[in-house]
Amino acid sequence: EVEKTACPSGKKAREIDESLIFYKKWELEACVDAALLATQMDRVNAIPFTYEQLDVLKHKLDELYPQGYPESVIQHLGYLFLKMSPEDIRKWNVTSLETLKALLEVNKGHEMSPQVATLIDRFVKGRGQLDKDTLDTLTAFYPGYLCSLSPEELSSVPPSSIWAVRPQDLDTCDPRQLDVLYPKARLAFQNMNGSEYFVKIQSFLGGAPTEDLKALSQQNVSMDLATFMKLRTDAVLPLTVAEVQKLLGPHVEGLKAEERHRPVRDWILRQRQDDLDTLGLGLQGGIPNGYLVLDLSMQEALS
């Protein structure tokens, strides 16, 4: 807390300017009017205040707006945003995308802090859903943003927003998240033709079911091995050797290098060795000729 002391003669601030950086903490408290500060917040960011001085300025705003700052002030917080706690931010009502961008800019190039996470949460909840413009903005600042959301949160993403997603935005998503995003992507891109559709849907295929992979195998898509390795194991297992060969096209040769890794390893174990041999890749571990394969899951379902 800064003690209440009278402002020395001639030091009363008429405007927020660089002369204030030479004020001591008690002088800032005594000589800067909170209402003046609020109306000239846009100047604060251009002045190299110390963090101690920023604490004083924050204290003045807190006294002026005990219920939370108005958006006109929030938009111009600049470096003062670095002084806010998640508790402060929960009092705010941020509705403008411009305000969100201005505050994200302050933290640009740095990891997402609890303050930024709280700000984003408040903003998205206020909007009711993650619309395309918001998603565009958030992934521009934090490419991993989408994958930081829970499957429940992702369910509020409208299919139209999927157009804003770039492949790198999905790099850290796990299968549960892709399970939610894939159907939305499929819906978003449904009116595109074959090759264009595949380019757009490719990043989301970690959530694709078997039937969709079978359909893709009929379209000469030439899926690369990196994409294939991210597919759900349970979606890959039912694919035949012929379907995988069509799905991968010229990339099928890459299976040999991945034969010890999932999902390739598990898929090999489900194929007849005869069928694997037709690929001419030397893949081993398939079901020997003459063996009968019982699908126990089917048997359990019948009994």
Epitope: E18, I21, F22, P48, T50, Y51, E52, Y79, L82, K83, H110, S113, P114, Q115
Partner: nanobody
């Protein structure tokens, strides 16, 4: 963490010049603004000059036109204070300060270098 080490202080006659240096090491990419403070015996800490992260310089009224603050953002961040037309009242311990970006942001201080202006 940021470490700051000052050098360049000494005894100089009134009207003379000195150039103070402050070498920063550690997490220098996170440095935001850098400053020179001074503290005369029995007095409080006084901000002398600031150079902001965009290179803008700000000076205490009594040193304006005589002192120049500058900063290099090379591998080794260096802060300088060129002091010309020195006066006895400029005698003090000159201390380098840097603050870093982040939540909540931190202030770092050097040990200081002594400047004495006397005939």
């Amino acid at each position: 963490q940021v470490q700051l080490v000052e050098s360049g202080g000494g005894l100089v006659q009134p009207g003379g010049s000195l150039r103070l240096s402050c070498a920063a090491s550690g997490s220098i990419s996170s440095i935001r603004h850098m400053r020179w403070y001074r503290q005369a015996p029995g007095k409080g800490l006084e901000l002398v000059a600031t150079v902001s992260n965009d290179g803008s310089a700000y000076y205490l009224g009594s040193v304006k036109g005589r002192f120049t603050i500058s900063r290099t953002n090379a591998k080794n961040t260096l802060l300088y204070l060129q002091m010309n037309s020195l006066k006895p009242e400029d005698s003090a311990l000159y201390i380098c300060n840097a603050d870093t970006w982040g939540w909540p942001g931190a202030d770092y201080w050097g040990q200081g270098t002594q400047v004495t202006v006397s005939s």
